[in-house]
């Protein structure tokens, strides 16, 4: 596998993560955070090692920023668990809240 394919996967994975975060903001649906975290990581990791790497880098950066702004440790752990769930290839729908519109 070439460095360029890794880079391509990382770019696509970053885009998957961005789409998940953007959908999460748009949906603004109570109880959906874990689903979107899992979905972003799942989609990114499916791209390959580059995608999984990008997902990890982005979620770590996001966690650090949120921690800096006083995001609760409990919420942070729940988000992390959802991130790892998606990144390990498990079905993100496990965290899907009832009634969340199908477009997501």
């Amino acid at each position: 596998r070439s460095f360029f394919s890794f880079l391509g996967e990382a770019f696509d994975g970053a885009r998957d993560m961005w789409r998940a975060y953007s959908d999460m903001r748009e949906a603004n649906y109570i109880g959906s955070d874990k689903y979107f975290h899992a979905r972003g990581n799942y989609d990114a990791a499916k791209r390959g090692p580059g995608g999984a790497w990008a997902a990890e880098v982005i979620t770590d950066a996001r966690e650090n920023i949120q921690r800096f702004f006083g995001h609760g440790a409990e919420d942070s752990l729940a988000d992390q668990a959802a991130n790892e769930w998606g990144r390990s290839g498990k079905d993100p729908n496990h965290f899907r809240p009832a009634g969340l519109p199908e477009k997501y």
Partner: antibody, heavy 121, light 107 residues
């Protein structure tokens, strides 16, 4: 204690619709999703779908899309399920079951007593 | 959809015996499995969730085990009230699906 009280048995003609209800009590209604499950001799237990009692939005099993419509009334802590264009295949016992959370995926610790729907000409 | 297959479809046993019912998932569901008991004319009752966690009020003679695709429900020292039908159900992803059922009858 948690209780789910369902409406009574229905005998209906083919082609018409029927609306059954399930009233929750003994807990905070909007904290838990409400699911519907069909039990017939032919197919054992089948998950129809679930309604988010906070938003009133429903998620359906693909198989029951267009057949079942779920709604709720927060003021009376009641959920409803309407079954359209009934055929003999829809003759079954329908249960409401409270989810373990607001997620789609759940186990069911609390069930209604069931509503028997019989479709017959 | 995830298919849940139970075996046996029916079994006969006597009071005091130990029985095991198995449930197979068509794909990996990790430990996201529940078991229910249903008596004639009654609603199902939750026995076990997360494959091995006993629901509130369920006697300790019931025990669940397994993960991935293979699961089992064991009933030690059968009591007269244990006869009825048993169903497994996955709670991993959507749609939720139930097992084909096992009818436990008195020998």
């Amino acid at each position: 204690q948690v209780q789910l009280q369902q409406s009574g048995a229905e005998l209906v003609r083919p082609g018409v619709s029927v609306k059954i209800s399930c009233k929750g009590s003994g807990y905070t209604f909007t904290d838990y999703a409400m699911h519907w499950v069909k039990q017939s001799h032919a197919k054992s237990l089948e998950w129809i779908g679930v309604i988010n009692t906070y938003y009133g939005d429903a998620s359906y099993n693909q198989k029951f899309k267009g057949k079942a419509t779920m709604t709720e009334d927060k003021s009376s802590s009641t959920v409803y399920m309407e079954l359209a264009r009934l055929t003999s295949e829809d003759s079954a016992i329908y249960y409401c079951a409270r989810g373990s959370s607001i997620m789609i995926t759940s186990w069911f610790a609390y069930w209604g007593q069931g509503t028997l729907v019989t479709v017959s000409a | 959809d995830i298919q849940m297959t139970q075996s046996p479809a029916s079994l006969s046993a006597s009071v005091g015996e130990t029985v095991t019912i198995t449930c197979r998932a068509s794909e990996n569901i990790y430990s996201y499995l529940a078991w229910y008991q249903q008596k004639q004319g009654k609603s199902p009752q939750l026995l076990v969730y997360n494959a091995k966690t006993l629901a509130e009020g369920v006697p300790s003679r019931f025990s669940g085990s397994g993960s991935g695709t293979q699961f089992s429900l064991k009933i030690n020292s059968l009591q007269p009230e244990d006869f009825g039908s048993y169903y497994c159900q996955h709670h991993y992803g959507t749609p939720i699906t139930f097992g084909t059922g096992t009818k436990l009858e008195l020998k």
